[in-house]
């Protein structure tokens, strides 16, 4: 049967062994070999049954004495089998064996759970020689036990190529429950059930669990560890913890906050990073995410012009990087811009609206109805056009750029003329006779030069031709008209 000693037990005598005399008086150790020095606690466990050697791992010596009597089998003496003590207490236990003096260089090693204990453990081996045998006591002490000291300890002795192994000494370190799984913070959907888990271990077992929600106990009776709490749903943030109880007392887990997912707060600090004629680059600072990651954002753009129809353009974008280029805007226009973002619960309110303006752009269309004709009397080419629609000027007209290319006998020459914004006609001097003049006109704003009109060609004859008629922008489908005067 396993002998069990609790920490309340009185210390055993140091070594009650089968030797004549008392160790305290006439058997001071001949040799003491400390493996590591250290405080030796008062509480000490040592052999209680010195008489009966165990039958486990026995070495039978081959050597015989002068009288040729065989030596008795070698074995560690029985000792306490199970030591139960509280965390942070000190403990000392030992193995003892009597070895005939004919054996030299006997060493005892300590093993825990199958692994040799090396290094700075508090192990001391003491030798008590007598006429025929030497009593060896190997002591092992731990000054402040921890849970990691739990386990099965044995002594091993190598003798005559044989290994002698002691009975195990089971050390059970008891303490307050120790959490192996604690509830975790979570973000949950309103009124939706979710689970929390709590697990704690001893020894001593059993460990019982109480759940606490906002400082009120959820379960009136203890539940065996591990325990899963199904929370039936929350309407507001709550704090949960679990209490683990065993015979040593109570340990309380960390408190965890369970948040309720909600729609995000609106973005703040919407700002204009850059404006062009047809685009505005905006950035924003996201609002509070409502305990649920942002999915995407929506940029709402409406014309600030009181005469506009008030329609809203919506641009969807990813939530990151809190930056968006709004395109396809009109030049030189005012806009109100707001941003809203969404998470799995829904859309935030729109941010405070900000005003933004596009800059002047180059006109987006060319002048219309370009007409070219030769004024032979003054040796000029007259050009007429209609200005582009105001909407498509993309700014304030500052004038026009006229390109006229003269081609004759393999020679080509392009000239550019700038004219003011007031007129819708221009006159250019004939540069070459017996040549083709190709005219294109572009509108100009401070934002730049717009597209050129389709080319209109006119043939300038040699002197002496009488008939002439105007040439004009081709009707759709006529690709490259040439009018010969």
């Amino acid at each position: 049967a396993i002998t069990e000693a609790r920490e309340e037990a009185k210390p055993y005598p140091l070594f009650p062994g089968p030797f004549p005399g008392s160790l305290q008086t006439d058997h001071t150790p001949l040799l003491s070999l400390p493996h590591a020095s250290g405080y030796q606690p008062a509480l000490m466990f040592s052999p209680t049954q010195p008489g009966r050697p165990h039958t486990g791992n026995v070495a039978i010596p081959q050597v015989t004495s002068v009288e040729s009597k065989p030596l008795p089998p070698l074995a560690f003496k029985h000792t306490v089998g199970h030591i139960i003590l509280s965390e942070h207490k000190g403990v000392k236990f030992n193995c003892s064996i009597s070895v005939p003096n004919i054996y030299q260089d006997t060493t005892i090693s300590w093993w825990k759970d199958g692994k040799e204990l090396l290094g700075a453990h508090h192990a001391i081996t003491q030798f008590y020689p007598d006429d025929e045998v030497t009593a060896i006591i190997a002591s092992f002490s731990i000054t402040s036990v921890q849970r990691s000291d739990n386990g099965s300890y044995i002594c091993k002795m190598k003798i005559n190529n044989e290994e002698i192994v002691s009975d195990p000494i089971y050390i059970e370190v008891q303490g307050l429950p120790h959490f192996t799984k604690q509830p975790e913070s979570m973000n949950v959907t309103r009124n939706t059930a979710f689970n929390l888990t709590c697990q704690a271990v001893g020894p001593p077992e059993p460990v019982n669990i109480f759940w606490v929600q906002n400082s009120s106990r959820v379960n009136e009776q203890p539940e065996k560890s591990p325990s899963v709490l199904t929370v039936p749903g929350l309407t507001e943030m709550a704090v949960f913890s679990c209490e683990a109880h065993n015979d040593k007392g109570l340990t309380v887990s960390k408190g965890v906050q369970i948040n309720i997912k909600a729609i995000p707060s609106p973005p703040t600090e919407v700002s204009i990073r850059n404006s062009t004629a047809h685009s505005i680059l905006i950035s924003w600072v996201p609002g509070f995410d409502g305990y649920s990651p942002f999915r995407n954002c929506s940029i709402q753009v409406k014309e600030a012009d009181p005469l506009s129809n008030g329609s809203v353009m919506i641009f969807n974008t990813s939530a990151l990087p809190h930056l968006y280029q709004i395109k396809q805007l009109q030049a030189l226009a005012n806009y109100s811009i707001g941003v809203s973002c969404m998470n799995e619960i829904g859309w935030s309110a729109v941010s405070p609206w900000i005003l933004a303006s596009t800059t002047e752009g180059a006109p987006s269309v060319a002048p219309l109805n370009v007409t070219v004709f030769l004024n032979e009397s003054s040796d000029n080419v007259d050009i007429r056009w209609m200005k582009p629609p105001t909407k498509q000027q993309d700014g304030e007209l500052v004038g026009y750029r006229i390109s006229h290319v003269w081609q004759s006998a393999g020679i080509s020459k392009e000239l550019l003329e700038e004219v003011g914004q007031n007129g819708s006609r221009a006159r250019i001097s004939v540069q070459v006779h017996n040549a083709t003049c190709t005219v294109r006109i572009a509108a100009v704003t401070r934002g730049g030069v717009g597209p050129f009109s389709d080319p209109v060609k006119i043939f300038i004859p040699a002197h002496g031709w009488v008939d002439y008629a105007p040439s004009s922008t081709p009707a759709p489908g006529n690709a490259d008209p040439v009018l010969i005067i």
Epitope: W211, N214, S216, N219, E220, Q221, E223, L229, P232
Partner: antibody, heavy 118, light 106 residues
Amino acid sequence: QVQLVQSGSELKKPGASVKVSCKASGYTFANYGVHWVRQAPGQGLEWMGWINTYQGEPTYAQGFTGRFVFSLDTSVSTAYLQISSLKAEDTAVYYCTRGARYAYMDYWGQGTLVTVSS
Amino acid sequence: EIVLTQSPATLSLSPGERATLSCRASSSVGYMHWYQQKPGQAPRPLIYATSNLASGIPARFSGSGSGTSYTLTISSLEPEDFAVYYCQQWSSNPRTFGGGTKVEIK
């Protein structure tokens, strides 16, 4: 299936004692507390307290201390309510209930009518 | 202790009508449970933890609320729904019941 079966109606004289039993079946008795609820004639429900079936520890609501005793016999999965020194105002139906998480009374006995009359 | 006040004390309605029963707590509670009691019978669980239907309870019953204000709604009264309804709080001891609301046939 879970069942709480209470003892039958009692007619007692003032000053006497009565012991109402509540036998549980269909679940592990020690895993759930047993609550007691009183309902006087034509009145609402009144929580009297509960007994911890794991440790045997009773908890009494205000107004139910002294003459009221909750007890257990775990070997037969039974809870008891004993009322001593009965008064006319103790006339009521007494219910035992199983206490689940969040103090939810998920199963109820059929009720025991205790009539105190001289 | 937390006092639960149910209103109205009596609700007179016809089958098919919607019933809305209120339960107010004297201070904030975590959850509210609801029970139904018919004459001569033990109360039976109706709604657990504010909004969860007890087993076998039809979907016309629903519960809502938080803090100090809780509601039991019966979307369309059936003849078997005419009974007394009690709320009961979970938050602190002692466990308390409301005074009850009687739903009667008009």
